[in-house]
């Protein structure tokens, strides 16, 4: 039994890191393998992650971690019984994929303005709480070409757009994702989408 693709890990910079790797053949990850991990820290202890299958030869492990700080470094040991298959390390702050924003809501009761709000996925004491920026994707269910992205580079988790920038009388969907420039993170997954019917009063034409 050998590792074909070494584990690569990403952290949500909060409490979970996800590591994925591939073996050289079909493997029952949960019964044959264990991933041991430990924070390099005086007050830390070793933890064991039981991997799950991710395709025939692929394995994935969800590592429960202490709140992350930038200096953290974890040692990783991949075992098959008594055999050490791979040894490595992982700095969560260098491989961050933020959590997806939640609770996306479209408020349509403001006159001719759409207000989109969502929740920051981090608690206020987390470093990323004040460092996330967002991308909001709005698209028409009727017209695949009617697809737009709004970059929200301020900290407030909201976006205002004129209802008239979208077509009236049809349904739209929106979703939002996050990233943090400070740690050069990847984008988060998209939030679940939300749907609304766009309608607004057309302005009277002047003759």
């Amino acid at each position: 039994m050998k590792v074909l693709q070494e584990p690569t890990c990403v952290s949500d910079y909060m409490s979970i890191s996800t590591c994925e790797w591939k073996m050289n053949g079909p493997t029952n990850c949960s019964t044959e393998l264990r991933l041991l991990y430990q924070l390099v820290f005086l007050l830390s202890e070793a933890h064991t992650c039981i991997p799950e299958n991710n395709g025939g030869a692929g394995c994935v492990c969800h590592l429960l971690m202490d709140d992350v700080v930038s200096a953290d470094n974890y040692t990783l040991d991949l075992w098959a019984g008594q055999q050490l298959l791979w040894k490595g390390s992982f700095k969560p702050s260098e491989h961050v994929k933020p959590r997806a924003p939640g609770n996306l809501t479209v408020h349509t009761n403001v006159s001719d303005t759409l207000l989109l709000t969502w929740s920051n996925p981090y608690p206020p004491d987390n470093y990323l709480y004040n460092h996330l920026t967002y991308a909001v994707n709005i698209w028409s269910e009727n017209d695949p070409a009617d697809f737009r992205i709004y970059n929200v580079t301020y900290l407030e988790p909201s976006l205002r757009i004129a209802a008239s920038t979208l077509k009236s009388g049809i349904s739209y969907r929106a979703r939002v994702r996050a990233w943090a420039q400070c740690y050069n993170t990847t984008w988060s997954e998209w939030s679940p989408s939300t749907k609304w019917h766009n309608s607004y009063r057309e302005p009277f034409e002047q003759h």
Partner: antibody, heavy 115, light 109 residues
Framework: EVQLVESGGGLVQPGGSLRLSCAAS????????MFWVRQAPGKGLEWVSG???????SYADSVKGRFTISRDNAKNSLYLQMNSLRAEDTAVYYC?????????WGQGTLVTVSS | EIVLTQSPGTLSLSPGERATLSCRAS???????LAWYQQKPGQAPRLLIY???SRATGIPDRFSGSGSGTDFTLTISRLEPEDFAVYYC??????????FGQGTKVEIK
């Protein structure tokens, strides 16, 4: 908002015991290492003890064998059991959250060891 | 055990002046594990700088940290009245734990 509130300080005779408590709120207590740091009157800061999320502990040489740090994650509380107290243990005792450094501190509780 | 020595013991300056505080370690310290704190009379210490040069949340940009190895510096570019306080450096070591310098008092001249 992160809050750490110490209690349990007071006047105790040399050789006596005292138990300090720290009530934590505003963060996930169970995922953070916690510490006690003290400051003798007019002196500098001295790290006393720390406890990791899994219960691993460490102590300064000056208190080893006399002080015991513990935590109750269900109650979001940190404790310091201080036995065989000496005059040189007189200090303000701060509860702090952190790891390699201490990012949040309580306001401290005064322990006076005197006959 | 790593010993941190801060200098000067007291720094007498006027508001608007630049303050330069030094922290010297008895052996090499990882920059990732060097921090600075501010403490005012009757108050708990407050984290200013971690990782030798990163400002903690809410700390004004007039505070900056630098250095590596055994020599570290905290600089206050223009002293404000609220900056007069005692400043401590602190390091973490995987075997010895956490130690503080003895402090530098920044007082009004």
């Amino acid at each position: 908002e992160v809050q750490l509130v110490e209690s349990g300080g007071g006047l105790v005779q040399p050789g006596g015991s005292l138990r300090l408590s720290c009530a934590a709120s505003g963060f996930t207590f169970s995922r953070n290492a916690m510490f006690w740091v003290r400051q003798a009157p007019g002196k500098g800061l001295e790290w006393v003890s720390g406890i990791g999320t899994g219960g691993a502990t460490s102590y300064a040489d000056s208190v080893k064998g006399r002080f015991t740090i513990s935590r109750d994650n269900a109650k979001n509380s940190l404790y310091l059991q201080m036995n065989s107290l000496r005059a040189e243990d007189t200090a303000v005792y701060y509860c702090a959250r952190g790891r390699y450094y201490f990012d949040y501190w309580g306001q401290g509780t005064l322990v006076t060891v005197s006959s | 055990e790593i010993v941190l020595t801060q200098s000067p013991g007291t720094l007498s300056l006027s508001p608007g002046e630049r303050a330069t505080l030094s922290c010297r370690a008895s052996q090499s310290v990882s920059s990732s594990y060097l921090a600075w704190y501010q403490q005012k009379p009757g108050q708990a210490p407050r984290l200013l700088i971690y990782g030798a040069s990163s400002r903690a949340t809410g700390i004004p940009d007039r505070f900056s940290g630098s250095g590596s190895g055994t020599d570290f510096t905290l600089t206050i570019s223009r002293l404000e009245p609220e900056d007069f306080a005692v400043y401590y450096c602190q390091q973490y070591d995987h075997s010895a734990g956490w130690t503080f310098g003895q402090g530098t008092k920044v007082e009004i001249k």
